[in-house]
């Protein structure tokens, strides 16, 4: 996908539907490409990306890529078509409403990637599946 400031005209009259017959329209995703991040050793992080974009195509989903090497940590947020690999990996969790990070093997760095299909779902990246900010009990713990 291309970011909104260089988007080309798109005029595709085909209505895209999911497996249940529900209409799929372009979703909103955080879209800051690659930025330095302070997210490290946390169960979940916010992207700190202020740019929420309409994806170019209805089939695209939100993606987040977290990378750590000897020098820095980066977080990449984009829209991407799950039929196509991203960073040479298949987006296997594209239908998930949450962005649950999964580690991928990349030489010389720690590499996590997630994808998801609800609006701006790559704003909240989750490294631990049991961690869920929608859990009211957990919110009580946080705000006490």
């Amino acid at each position: 996908t291309i970011p909104p400031h260089v988007q080309k005209s798109v005029n595709n009259d085909m209505i895209v539907t999911d497996n249940n017959g529900a209409v799929k329209f372009p979703q909103l995703c955080k879209f800051c490409d690659v930025r330095f991040s302070t997210c490290d050793n946390q169960k979940s992080c916010m992207s700190n990306c202020s740019i929420t974009s309409i994806c170019e195509k209805p089939q695209e989903v939100c993606v987040a890529v977290w990378r750590k090497n000897d020098e820095n940590i980066t977080l990449e947020t984009v829209c991407h078509d799950p039929k196509l690999p991203y960073h040479d990996f298949i987006l296997e969790d594209a239908a998930s409403p949450k962005c649950i990070m999964k580690e991928k093997k990349k030489p010389g760095e720690t590499f996590f990637m997630c994808s998801c299909s609800s609006d701006a779902c790559n704003d909240n990246i989750i490294f631990s599946e049991e961690y869920n900010t929608s859990n009211p009990d957990l919110l009580l713990v946080i705000f006490q």
Partner: antibody, heavy 116, light 107 residues
Framework: EVQLVESGGDLVKPGGSLRLSCAAS????????MSWVRQAPGKGLEWVGR??????????DYAAAVKGRFTISRDDSKNTLYLQMNSLKTEDTAIYYC???????WGQGTLVTVSS | DIQMTQSPSSLSASVGDRVTITCRAS??????LNWYQQKPGKAPKLLIY???SLQSGVPSRFSGSGSGTDFTLTISSLQPEDFATYYC?????????FGQGTKVEIK
């Protein structure tokens, strides 16, 4: 087919309350940010507020003109968006549209008239 | 809040004319600018998003351009069904604000 159907518009006195509903169908409602936009008679469009998805905490944003008086909520099990309007003023008189945030899906609108 | 100013507020044109509407933001909004068309008694319809991307199903006579603070909606050859009110909206920051509208009338 995506459908958004608003209801609950009425004539109400200043200071009164009203709750609008928007029944959504034809798409995965729980995955979408949803907004309310209003239009006073003969005037332009004004964004009222939005509710984000429940998985992102269901947080809300409001226009300054309605903050503290209006509350937007959603019930994903019923595919329904709500707008609770309290302390209504005459300047809240408008057609209220339910929309999928920043996408081209709007309801037909429901008229709210605030008058004594 | 970001203020959006459209000009002109109204214009008269004939079928076949080239029509240009401008929208200015009070601060830079990159390319986060949408254009809507509204006909009397109807909900608005999205024409252009991200300043220049044509919404699915919208005729190619509509085009958008600009970035930063200055944006343009162009109708290359006005058709009878294009007589309506047009609104710009920024989606760069919350609240997403609309311009005051431009009414395109028949000359």
């Amino acid at each position: 087919e995506v459908q958004l159907v608003e209801s609950g518009g009425d004539l109400v006195k200043p200071g009164g309350s009203l709750r609008l509903s928007c029944a959504a169908s034809g798409f995965t409602f729980s995955n979408a940010w949803m907004s309310w936009v209003r239009q006073a008679p003969g005037k332009g469009l004004e964004w009222v507020g939005r509710v984000k998805t429940t998985v992102s905490g269901g947080t809300t944003d409001y226009a300054a003109a309605v903050k503290g008086r209006f509350t937007i909520s959603r019930d994903d099990s019923k595919n329904t968006l709500y707008l609770q309007m309290n302390s209504l003023k005459t300047e809240d008189t408008a057609i209220y549209y339910c929309t999928i945030d920043l996408r081209d899906y709007w309801g037909q609108g429901t008229l709210v008239t605030v008058s004594s | 809040d970001i203020q959006m100013t459209q000009s002109p507020s109204s214009l008269s044109a004939s079928v076949g004319d080239r029509v240009t509407i401008t929208c200015r933001a009070s601060q830079s909004i990159s390319s986060y600018l949408n254009w809507y068309q509204q006909k009397p008694g109807k909900a608005p319809k999205l024409l252009i998003y991200a300043a220049s991307s044509l919404q699915s199903g919208v005729p190619s006579r509509f085009s958008g351009s600009g970035s930063g603070t200055d944006f343009t909606l162009t109708i290359s050859s006005l058709q009878p069904e294009d007589f309506a009110t047009y609104y710009c909206q920024q989606s760069y920051s919350t609240p997403p604000t609309f311009g005051q509208g431009t009414k395109v009338e028949i000359k």
